[in-house]
């Protein structure tokens, strides 16, 4: 063509992928008359027609471009649709009169890559390569042109370094056009690198400007060989008996080599390999005050068959031994004293508590209860706490029942039990007293006795109502060495002119829980003599 | 082995004043109630007081009653009788013994008794 | 209330006797019985429902039936010679009563 050198460069006209691209032709009306006018795309600098305009109206061209080709701007401008990477090249158009002008544009494609992926060498790097290894693979996949991409170390570039750092990269073209950049970072990495975080970063343009994009961040496995084993106790502060204890190896290299646990023998003072679970973890659970001791680690190199051993740990499982009463069943008089002592042992100090076991009350913070002039009331349930203050929940306690001897004490002395005739009866009687009484009742019935506490004994009593049996009532006598005490049940008969029973009478159950009767605690007190009495 | 040893007898004159004493060995004193029990020559026994094993409660027999004070000392294992305004009819052997349950139930060992003689 | 005791009571050698002891408080109480021997402290051979102490052979027994509290020894020794008495509390819980004594002959 003539004078083409020229020609003037041609005008930039950037899009994106799947756009439009508006291709002006900047003839003026000088240079050719706008209705009549020839559109070119030039490839490998061959002219192919594809649109042609006359009168101001528009024809595509069979061929690539046919159904994607308008016209704008009262014919000054030609639209292309769905702007594909192969639409990259130069548009030009052609005036015919008065004489042939052209015009050229230069489209330029731009797509985005998607989100660049990272995936690291899951074989991992060995510290101790004599080339890089391979770290990591970064793809950037369906961009336009191809992105560049940049390594990054801790948010450091990298860049290229002889022997230590090498950046290989490729790229394929899709058949869409579109390219996927793959990008392999290769590296010799140190023992501090096993924290290193690495990321691929894609830079790329649009019409918009300059872009980027990151991927993830990702460790490498990395694989040095352990110079320290050590062992580690979960959880941490004191333990106690009961406790789950773990006791784990733990390295400093990667892998970790192959670890066994030993506990010295107190007596033999040998090492004695302990059994662990499929981790290597020897799990202690529940710890008993046995398990403490001395314990170490070793770890074995499988590779070069290297041993390592760790610096011994003690480990103390605290604990309190079973609780001692002494006496451990005592038995005393009335108005006598007592003297409960406790014992126990422990890996700590030790506090001791008495309480009331029927009230939880706390009597006395001490490992010995005195108890002076024994009333029948104090019978019963003592329970020492052997505790260590200072580690919550190492505890354990012994319960001891004391006894006073006394004859039966009756629930209640007499009771009015409503009834119907012919019905079956549940009568019981209550009792307590030190030996326990045996109960006895003065009618026929299914009686069953039932021992309440060491010293308290329930007799329950099933009875057919006659009237031989509402004339007399039914007496229930307890007795033990010391003693005979009876009560009374009156049986009363329920009718429409009798009144809703109150509270205090049952149908049923005829047990009361009634305090019993205290006496004044003085220092010497004249006294009637104690009596086998009743309460009710 | 148990043992009750009584002393402290002797004649008094009517409206004078004795000190029993018993002295208990092999066994846990505290922890026993203790009685006096009497017997006037040639007649039955005849109990004339109690005391709980801490000491913390008495019992009379009603002759005796604002005559006579029981007592106990548990540090020394040794139980009293204080016998003021003594009478002709509290002549007797004095035994001291222990209750095998709580005061009173059944006394289960005895010592061998200390004569008291009330005679002018 | 009393505890009442016959004054004496005989029996023949190897023949079994009963001492009895009535009064109302034997109703709540049991009976202790003790036996003396002339010049010496009385000693325990009942107490309770019906125990012994040690050192008191079998052939001593004891029973309570209504008011009434009863010592039996089978196969009487001339040992068994003594005073008998009966002791428990009065049924208002006031006096501690002694039986007034039953003397056994073994004849």
């Known amino acids: 063509v003539p004078g083409e050198a020229e020609q003037p460069a041609p005008e930039l006209v950037e899009v994106e992928v799947g756009s439009t691209a508006l291709l002006k032709c900047g003839l003026s009306q000088s240079q050719g008359n706008l209705s009549h006018v020839d559109w070119f795309s030039v490839h490998k600098e061959k002219r192919t027609l594809i649109f042609r305009v006359r009168q101001g109206q528009g024809q595509s061209e069979p061929g690539e471009y046919e159904q994607r080709l308008s016209l704008q701007d009262r014919g000054a401008t030609l639209a292309l649709t769905q702007v594909t990477p192969q639409d990259e090249r130069i548009f030009l158009c052609q005036g015919k009169r008065p004489r042939s002008q052209e015009y050229r544009i230069q489209l330029r494609v731009y797509k985005a890559p998607e989100e660049p992926n990272i995936q690291v060498n899951p074989l991992g790097i060995p510290v101790n390569s004599k080339e890089p290894e391979e770290v990591a693979t970064c793809v950037g996949r369906n961009g336009y042109p191809i992105p560049q991409v940049i390594w990054y170390k801790n948010g450091r570039p990298l860049k290229e370094e002889k022997n230590r750092v090498h950046i290989q990269s490729s790229q394929t073209v899709e058949s869409s056009g579109l390219y996927t950049l793959q990008s392999i970072l290769k590296a010799q990495l140190v023992k501090e690198d096993k924290d290193a975080q690495f990321y691929c970063e894609l830079n790329y343009r649009l019409p918009s400007g300059n872009h980027m994009k990151e991927s993830r961040e990702v460790t490498v496995p990395v694989f040095y060989p352990t110079e320290k084993v050590w062992l580690e106790v979960e959880p941490v502060g004191m333990l106690k008996e009961g406790d789950r204890v773990e006791i784990r190896c733990l390295a400093d290299g990667n892998p970790p080599p192959h670890f066994s646990i030993s506990k010295q023998n107190p007596s033999t003072r040998e090492a004695e390999e302990e059994t662990t679970n499929d981790n290597g973890v020897l799990v202690l659970e529940p710890a008993r005050k046995e398990h403490s001791g001395r314990y170490e680690c070793q770890g074995l190199d499988l590779d070069t068959m290297i041993s390592l051993l760790s610096e011994p740990q003690e480990l103390l499982v605290n604990y309190v031994s079973d609780v001692r009463v002494s006496p451990a069943a005592p038995e005393r008089q009335e108005g006598s004293s007592l003297t409960l002592t406790c014992e126990a042992e422990s890996s700590q100090d030790l506090e001791f508590q008495w309480l009331r076991e029927e009230t939880g009350q706390v009597l006395e913070r001490g490992p010995v209860l005195q108890l002076h002039d024994l009333k029948r009331e104090a019978g019963g349930g003592y329970r020492c706490v052997a505790s260590v203050p200072s580690i919550p929940g190492l505890n354990r306690t012994q319960l001891v029942n004391v006894a006073i001897f006394g004859p039966p004490w009756m629930a209640f002395k007499e009771r009015k039990v409503w009834v119907k005739e012919n019905m079956v009866l549940n009568l019981s009687c209550e009792a307590s007293g030190h030996p326990r009484p045996t109960i006895s009742w003065n009618v026929n019935g299914t009686a069953s006795e039932q021992d309440q506490d060491p010293q308290r004994v329930l007799s329950t009593l099933n009875v057919l109502v006659t009237p031989e049996l509402l004339e007399t009532g039914v007496e229930c006598t307890a007795s033990n060495d010391l003693g005979k005490n009876t009560s009374i049940l009156f049986l009363e008969l329920v009718n429409l002119t009798t009144l809703t029973p109150d509270s205090n009478t049952t149908t049923g159950l005829s047990t009361s829980t009634a305090s019993p009767h205290t006496r004044a605690n003085s220092t010497s007190t004249e006294r009637k003599l104690p009596e086998p009495e009743s309460r009710g | 082995e148990v043992q009750l040893l009584e002393s402290g007898g002797g004649l008094v004159q009517p409206g004078g004043s004795l000190r029993l004493s018993c002295a208990a060995s092999g066994f846990t004193f505290s922890s026993y109630a203790m009685s006096w029990v009497r017997q006037a020559p040639g007649k039955g026994l005849e109990w004339v007081s109690a005391i709980s094993g801490s000491g913390g409660s008495t019992y009379y027999v009603d002759s005796v009653k604002g005559r006579f004070t029981i007592s106990r000392d548990n540090s020394k294992n040794t139980l009293y009788l204080q016998m003021n305004s003594l009478r002709a009819e509290d002549t007797a052997v004095y035994y001291c013994a222990r209750d095998i349950w709580g005061v009173t139930t059944a006394f289960d060992y005895w010592g061998q008794g200390t004569t008291v003689t009330v005679s002018s | 209330s009393e505890l009442t005791q016959d004054p004496a009571v005989s029996v023949a050698l190897g023949q079994t006797v009963r001492i009895t002891c009535q009064g109302d408080?034997?109703?709540?109480?049991?009976a202790s019985w003790y036996q003396q021997k002339p010049g010496q402290a009385p000693v325990l051979v009942i107490y309770g429902k019906n125990k012994r102490p040690s050192g008191i052979p079998d052939r001593f027994s004891g029973s309570t039936s209504g008011d009434t509290a009863s010592l039996s020894i089978t196969g009487a020794l001339a040992d068994d010679e003594a005073d008998y008495y009966c002791?428990?509390?009065?049924?208002?819980?006031?006096?501690?009563?002694f039986g007034g004594g039953t003397k056994l002959t073994v004849l």
């Open positions: 002791h428990s509390r009065d049924s208002s819980g006031d006096q501690i009563l």
């Open positions: 408080s034997l109703r709540s109480y049991y």
